[in-house]
Interface confidence: medium
């Protein structure tokens, strides 16, 4: 009888990550009696993938019942393939021995290549917000793809960007690869609604690239412009002063009124109006009882926006022309005599 041969008909198998790989192996004879084992790699450092006789291999199933006496099909399926599974797999026939089985013959090997999709690109912007006219860097990362060839593009609101640098690692052979790209974007005042998009194209994506986005609303800080105006007198001895806070983003803003340098009232922007460009406007008013002042009053609207140093705008209120009202010591509604911004 012809000596048993171990046949691995496929020199290579290409499988997409997440799918199941079928590694085919047949024997030409039932003799000698003995188990089959599958290994990844050859030599002393080879990795046991499946042992017919013992062990627990949850990802591996056999194509046929290896316990059948007449079985000569030793093919296996490996489920949920990842790039780490890439390598050359050997089907090895053992001869029953005592006390241990003895390796009898090996197949020629099947190279398993894993075609892995890149992970969804993750775009991250700068840690701190920046103001218009500044250039900020965005990074895009995608991992775990194979083969190495990949294309990455950057867009801002649909317009392709050209100022970026891209690296694919590692440079040498690997089971999977990562791409890292950094793009430079110049912010404009209209960018609150803008998006930066990183687009990755790979053979595994079948012409449908993956995209990662970053909203510039998380990156941009548009500082407010302030305008303090004096409204017509609402009642005798009362003047309404408004502070218009315009075109700011994000919304987090705190406003303090000061009368001659003393804190009168502090409030947090709440009921804001949104502009078409995504920035906000807000108005605060102060009702001043001019009869409480002998001299002119310097009213200051001081705004702390998004944790930045306060900006302010002042307005000089002339009170000399107004009659004095006896017994009044209230300078403004909700005023306190606190100093040093204490509430």
């Amino acid at each position: 009888e012809e000596e048993l041969q171990v046949i691995q008909p496929d020199k290579s198998v290409l499988v997409a990550a997440g799918e199941t790989a079928t590694l085919r192996c047949t024997a030409t004879s039932l003799i000698p009696v003995g188990p089959i084992q599958w290994f990844r790699g050859a030599g002393p450092g080879r990795e046991l993938i499946y042992n017919q006789k013992e062990g627990h291999f949850p990802r591996v199933t056999t194509v046929s019942d290896l316990t059948k006496r007449n079985n000569m099909d030793f093919s296996i399926r490996i489920g949920n393939i990842t790039p780490a599974d890439a390598g050359t797999y050997y089907c090895v026939k053992f001869r029953k021995g005592s006390p241990d089985d003895v390796e009898f013959k090996s197949g020629a090997g099947t190279e398993l290549s894993v075609r892995a999709k890149p992970s969804a690109p993750v775009v991250s912007g700068p840690a701190a917000r920046a103001t218009p006219q500044h250039t900020v860097s965005f990074t895009c990362e995608s991992h775990g793809f194979s083969p190495r060839d990949i294309t990455l593009k950057w867009f801002k609101n649909g317009n392709e960007l050209s100022d970026f640098q891209t690296n694919v690692d590692p440079v040498g052979e690997s089971v999977s690869y990562s791409i890292h790209s950094t793009a430079k974007v110049v912010l404009t005042r209209e960018d609150v609604h803008s998006q930066v998009i990183c687009e990755v194209a790979h053979v595994t994506l079948q012409g449908d690239p993956l995209r990662g986005t970053a909203n510039l609303s998380e990156t941009i800080r548009v500082p407010p412009t302030l305008e303090v105006t004096q409204q017509p007198v609402r009642a005798e001895n009362q003047v309404n002063v408004t502070c218009q806070v315009r075109k700011f983003y994000p919304q987090r803003l705190q406003l303090t009124w000061l009368e001659n340098g003393n804190v009168s009232r502090t409030e947090t922007a709440s009921t804001v109006t949104e502009n078409k460009d995504g920035t906000y406007n807000w108005m605060s008013w102060l009702l001043v009882n001019v009869s409480a002042h002998r001299d002119d009053v310097k009213l200051t609207c001081q705004v702390e926006h998004d944790g930045q140093p306060a900006v302010s705008k002042s307005h000089d209120l002339k009170v000399s022309a107004h009659p004095k009202e006896q017994g009044s010591n209230t300078a403004a509604e909700n005023t306190g005599s606190n100093e040093r911004n204490i509430y």
Partner: antibody
Framework: QVQLVESGGGLVKPGGSLRLSCAAS????????MHWVRQAPGKGLEWVSS????????YYADSVKGRFTISRDNAKNSLYLQMDSLRAEDTAVYYC???????????????WGQGTTVTVSS | DIQMTQSPSSLSASVGDRVTITCQAS??????LNWYQQKPGKAPKLLIY???NLETGVPSRFSGSGSGTDFTFTISSLQPEDIATYYC?????????FGGGTKVEIK
């Protein structure tokens, strides 16, 4: 690691004073707003006072305004609460707490000290 | 001042149960709401910030949701180590205010 350690609590008579301290380590103290929060025995949490990173903005609960003074020494990585005109209702465990986000306040308190007990009783 | 109404004030549930705590603000506070856990004799611990974001290192069985005035805190599967009092906290305006707390016990 980030750590806050309070000290200075104790027994004091009504009308008396105490100064609580909070020693900070493991983070850039000068970049963070800080807070004092107290908890009366068997009761819930009550915010007491907050101070911004540069100490230009200070806030107090109405219940302590005019009696308590919050301050900080960024060079010493320390936060303080000077408590004057103490009342029985000020009896509580006092916690110092770090703001979650640097330079700005209003994001919450992500690190707390173990607390120091203040008892006001005659 | 913004009042934070937390309910229930206490609850008893079995290990593995889903536990829900609500917090209602007396006015719109957007998402400026945090949830804290306090175990007996210990300092509070931040669990959820900005209404729904899980603080680093906090088990994923804890979650939060809501915006405006109505907020919910959930423990998807109660564990023995979750015995504690839970507080909501608003940060929309000073004074910062806390809910009255919810004491969670194991049946």
């Amino acid at each position: 690691q980030v750590q806050l350690v309070e000290s200075g609590g104790g027994l004091v008579k009504p009308g008396g004073s105490l100064r609580l301290s909070c020693a900070a380590s493991g983070f850039t103290f000068s970049s963070y707003s800080m807070h004092w929060v107290r908890q009366a025995p068997g009761k819930g949490l009550e915010w007491v006072s907050s101070i911004s990173s540069s100490d230009s903005w200070i806030y107090y609960a109405d219940s302590v305004k005019g009696r308590f003074t919050i301050s900080r020494d960024n060079a010493k990585n320390s936060l303080y609460l000077q408590m004057d005109s103490l009342r029985a209702e000020d009896t509580a465990v006092y916690y110092c707490a770090k703001e979650r986000v640097d330079y700005w306040h209003g994001y919450g308190m992500d690190v707390w000290g173990q607390g120091t007990t203040v008892t006001v009783s005659s | 001042d913004i009042q934070m109404t937390q309910s229930p004030s206490s609850l008893s549930a079995s290990v593995g149960d889903r536990v829900t705590i609500t917090c209602q603000a007396s006015q719109d506070i957007s998402n400026y709401l945090n949830w804290y856990q306090q175990k007996p004799g210990k300092a509070p611990k931040l669990l959820i910030y900005d209404a729904s974001n899980l603080e680093t290192g906090v088990p994923s069985r804890f979650s939060g949701s809501g915006s405006g005035t109505d907020f919910t805190f959930t423990i998807s599967s109660l564990q023995p180590e979750d015995i504690a009092t839970y507080y909501c906290q608003q940060l929309s305006n000073y004074p910062i205010t806390f809910g009255g707390g919810t004491k969670v016990e194991i049946k």
